[in-house]
Interface confidence: medium
């Protein structure tokens, strides 16, 4: 077993809905008995080695578990001794122990069960940022931006929604932000504006609420 080594973090923590890159290097002897290409898979601990599908694999013929399909990706090339794992749209039920297996047909060569990865998916604690450029002046259009700069680009793009008693508005969005264009009225002063961000890949929603401070230009009549 000394010829088989896997170097990776013992424990990785990620908040739900977000992404994490797990660096990993894998070493195995050059055994001539296995003439096929080297493929690798990450499997969840507790599954039967032969009867359960992996969570991520470099073998295009092998099925992966539906629960992790498209979210867990073996980024590295095991033939180049790279077993790096990328997880997007992390879900609470992804929490668990994982191990790497290297395969070279026709025989399964080795499962690195002595170097298991402990994955912890915690509640999403971060909240969106709402950015107001300058002051809100009654009767003048303004752009409010709700952003989640901490979201990862590779994840499922979040869904933004705005809630307010303010008047009708227009919103546009990018991958990690949404711009709300609206013209505040004097009566909007003191009302609340909420930006909700839903990470559908993990089924989690976070929000940020602000209180509008609407100013008047001198000469405007107070109602």
């Amino acid at each position: 077993d000394l010829e088989f080594q896997l170097v990776a973090p013992e424990s990785v923590t990620v908040e739900e809905g977000l992404c994490v890159h797990v660096p990993c290097s894998v070493f195995y002897p050059s055994i001539k008995l296995t003439l096929g290409p080297v493929t690798g898979s990450w499997l969840r601990k507790g599954v039967s080695l032969h009867e359960d599908s992996p969570v991520a694999t470099s073998d295009p013929r092998q099925l992966v578990q539906k629960a992790t399909q498209g979210r867990f990706q073996l980024l590295g090339d095991p033939q180049k001794h790279d077993c790096s794992l990328f997880i997007r749209d992390a879900q609470k039920n992804d929490t668990g122990m994982y191990f790497f297996r290297v395969v070279r047909e026709p025989f399964v060569r080795y499962s690195y069960k002595k170097s298991q990865l402990s994955l912890h998916v915690t509640s999403l604690s971060r909240t969106p940022d709402i950015i107001i450029p300058g002051t809100l002046e009654a009767g003048y259009p303004s752009n409010l931006t709700c952003s989640v700069p901490w979201a990862c680009e590779q994840g499922t793009p979040p869904t933004f929604s705005w809630m307010s008693t303010a008047l009708t508005s227009l919103s546009s969005r990018t991958t990690d932000s949404s711009v709300l264009t609206f013209t505040p009225q004097p009566q909007d002063h003191g009302t609340k504006l909420t930006c909700l961000v839903t990470f559908s890949g993990a089924g989690v929603t976070v929000e940020r609420t602000i209180q509008l401070n609407v100013t008047r230009k001198s000469g405007q009549m107070r109602e």
Epitope: E3, P29, I31, K32, L33, L35, G36, L49, H50, E51, R61, E105, P106, F107, V108, R109, Y110
Partner: antibody
Amino acid sequence: EVQLLESGGGLVQPGGSLRLSCAASGFTFSSYAMSWVRQAPGKGLEWVSVISGSGGSTYYADSVKGRFTISRDNSKNTLYLQMNSLRAEDTAVYYCAKSPSDGYFDYWGQGTLVTVSS
Amino acid sequence: DIQMTQSPSSVSASVGDRVTITCRASQGISSWLAWYQQKPGKAPKLLIYAASSLQSGVPSRFSGSGSGTDFTLTISSLQPEDFATYYCQQAFDFPITFGGGTKVEIK
């Protein structure tokens, strides 16, 4: 319980053909590499051929290369060995064997005798 | 091809004896070696794999050691059911090869 049951052995003349079958049960057949290993009367063990779980990879001993073909039908949980151009030295008990990993054989069938004689 | 040479070819021993069988590979095979037991008219049975790992269900009186080219199978206290022929097998390179066998007989 893992079971491997060979069939298809018998007496055949030199130059003739024979097809051996191995019916597997008690495990997920498609997940395992399977081999044929033979044993001439009163002699030791000789590995003949192996096929990967998917059937995509096959390997043969030089003594049978070009004459024998290993195959499998995962839908029927069955392993095959097609033996052509048989020679007297192919006379042996033929075992099918399951490989858990690493090129070892953890379960074997009871064997089927192939006799090549005129 | 990797040649596997077993010695002795036969050994006479009594119940309770400690029996040692050696297997030598013609080139280094790391720990890619298995040991099998075969009784007359029966299929071989896997005892040891990866040179020293005991197959599930095999009595602990069987043990394996070695690495590289020299390997040993030891039966610490021979039992009546242990009288059989033992084979080593390398799983390092194609073609997979077996040793010639060692017959353990009753003294």
